[in-house]
């Protein structure tokens, strides 16, 4: 017997062939003996059975000897043995229906699970086997389950169902929601606009909910909220903003905040977060403010850092084209009596310049210019 | 919902080979079969010839010997290659779904041949 | 090949107008036949099959009818958006083939 494997919802094609080349009489039954479909002459002709208005034929193959019946929005329930019969003679044909789904929104949240439920007929014993995007297979019987979905888990899961040493592979689309960076720095001097984007790691037609960002500024003891905001069909909304720093924000995606200046008590660390609509949990993003200072008072002329900095970022002070006068592994870093010239400080990690700001000291006669 | 895409080269010189590709999705492919159709300027619809899932084809007499028709399943792709092309093969090319009718289209190609 | 001769070719009409096109096929194609609208620049769009049977989404202005050689396609009231051309094609053998079109013009 033929074992043919289907997909739910969607046309499957039966075959069955005579050994002449022609049209002739055959019919098509379920194995109840219910007759499905014939023919009679050139006249396709349908029986009682419940797959009357999805069970079709081909006219052009009969006259090849060939008279399929497909069968179209295939159902679980259609697994049965199909008979046709031409020649006076019978071919069975076994066809299972199998289909697989993912039993929550195939948008799911960074770090949620998903689940795929295999739907198969009674006596059936299949296994499946997923790939993901990233190529990690997972295996299993009737649900296969991953856990804390990561932004890489976006895309195509093909799934392969085996049963009857036949295969049939399923392709599931699967979103996963997410900030495109989990976190980010901006490095500014003091004074300059700050900008900071939070762009989105997927795209869909209607996007709507609420965000918040949380700031915790270092010198500062406990975090505050600076702004709130609604989304709506990708347009956005500030619902309420503090006063101090008066942040604004872009109508349109990406998020789009702007801080009209870095300021030393702005340093910090934020947290972003955007509540969808109809979905449980939140997207996160973390974002940094470090904000540089050179100033001159008298005769020391310092270089400061502010915020979240790593332990191994390198503050200098040098003065422009020589070698650098200090360099530190700390937030702040001085220089007595500074000879006259532009100098230069630099925030650096492994020799990459992150941040510089100039400063201009003057002969001591004069008071200094900061560019 | 069923669509078909469809591309591939628009102008052509005389005996050379016409290649077209039809990407099929949002439906079944493989209970199917795909069909390629031709309509030259100001005229009818002439069928050229079909394909299913398993590589079975079918094609039409007049065209048959120099006609290709492939398939590539995994991508739910299906091409047609018409060797040695002359003016007489200048039309719109349609891909098209088919059982007994060709209830979805590819929105064409004009394929224009000429020295 | 299984010939199939539409007539007329063309038919002016006005809006409101019952419009009638038939299609001879030969030899007999038993009811394997279809009805195609095309309007200019576009893919045709299936309208009938089986002779008889509504595609889905199809205004119910548009009937088919006939069995064997003769076939109509029968628009009760035509509306703006039906000017077009028409194409009927048989189902019944290799090579699938098309009637020659008859196109619906404003009077």
């Known amino acids: 017997k033929k074992v043919v494997l289907g997909k739910k919802g969607d046309t499957v094609e039966l075959t069955c062939t005579a050994s002449q080349k022609k049209s002739i009489q055959f019919h098509w039954k379920n194995s109840n003996q219910i007759k499905i479909l014939g023919n009679q002459g050139s006249f396709l002709t349908k029986g009682p059975s419940k797959l009357n208005d999805r069970a079709d034929s081909r006219r052009s193959l009969w006259d090849q000897g060939n008279f399929p019946l497909i069968i179209k929005n295939l159902k679980i329930e259609d697994s049965d043995t199909y008979i046709c019969e031409v020649e006076d003679q019978k071919e069975e044909v076994q066809l299972l229906v199998f289909g697989l789904t993912a039993n929550s929104d195939t948008h799911l949240l960074q770090g949620q699970s998903l689940t795929l439920t295999l739907e198969s007929p009674p006596g059936s014993s299949p296994s499946v086997q997923c790939r993901s995007p990233r190529g990690k297979n997972i295996q299993g019987g009737k649900t296969l389950s991953v856990s804390q979905l990561e932004l890489q888990d976006s895309g195509t899961w093909t799934c392969t169902v085996l049963q009857n040493q036949k295969k049939v592979e399923f392709k599931i689309d699967i979103v996963v929601l997410a900030f495109q960076k989990a976190s980010s720095i901006v490095y500014k001097k003091e004074g300059e606009q700050v900008e900071f984007s939070f762009p989105l790691a997927f795209t869909v037609e209607k996007l709507t909910g609420s965000g918040e960002l949380w700031w915790q500024a270092e010198r500062a003891s406990s975090s505050k909220s600076w702004i709130t905001f609604d989304l709506k069909n990708k347009e956005v909304s500030v619902k309420r903003v503090t006063q101090d720093p008066k942040l604004q924000m872009g109508k349109k995606l990406p998020l789009h905040l702007t801080l009209p200046q870095a300021l030393p008590q702005y340093a910090g660390s934020g947290n972003l977060t955007l509540a969808l609509e109809a979905k449980t949990g939140k997207l996160h993003q973390e974002v940094n403010l470090v904000v540089m200072r050179a100033t001159q008072l008298q005769k020391n002329l310092t270089c400061e850092v502010w915020g979240p900095t790593s332990p191994k970022l390198m503050l200098s002070l040098k003065l422009e084209n020589k070698e650098a006068k200090v360099s530190k592994r700390e937030k702040a870093v001085w220089v007595l009596n500074p000879e006259a010239g532009m100098w230069q400080c630099l925030l650096s990690d492994s020799g990459q310049v992150l941040l510089e700001s100039n400063i201009k000291v003057l002969p001591t006669w004069s008071t200094p210019v900061q560019p | 919902q069923v669509q078909l895409q469809q591309w591939g080269a628009g102008l052509l010189k005389p005996s050379e080979t016409l290649s077209l590709t039809c990407a099929v999705s949002g439906g079944s492919f493989s209970g199917y079969y795909w069909s390629w159709i031709r309509q030259p300027p100001g005229k009818g619809l002439e069928w050229i010839g079909e394909i299913n899932h398993s590589g079975s084809t079918n094609c039409n007499p007049s065209l048959k010997s120099r006609v290709t028709i492939s398939v590539d399943t995994s991508n739910n792709q299906f091409s047609l290659k018409l060797s040695s092309v002359t003016a007489a093969d200048t039309a719109v090319y349609y891909c098209a779904r088919v059982l007994n009718y060709f209830d979805y289209w590819g929105q064409g190609t004009l394929v224009t041949v000429s020295s | 090949d299984i010939q199939m001769t539409q007539s007329p070719s063309s038919v002016s009409a006005s809006v409101g107008d019952r419009v009638t096109i038939t299609c001879r096929a030969s030899p007999d194609i038993a009811n394997w036949l279809a009805w195609y609208q095309q309007k200019p620049g576009k893919a045709p769009e299936l309208l009938i099959y089986?002779?008889?049977s509504l595609q889905s989404g199809v205004p119910s202005r548009f009937s088919g009818s006939g069995s064997g050689t003769d076939f109509t396609l029968t628009i009760s009231s035509l509306q703006p958006e039906d000017f077009a051309t028409y194409f009927c094609?048989?189902?019944?053998?290799?090579?699938?083939?098309f009637g020659g079109g008859t196109k619906v013009e404003s009077k």
């Open positions: 089986a002779a008889s």
């Open positions: 094609q048989q189902a019944n053998s290799f090579p699938l083939t």
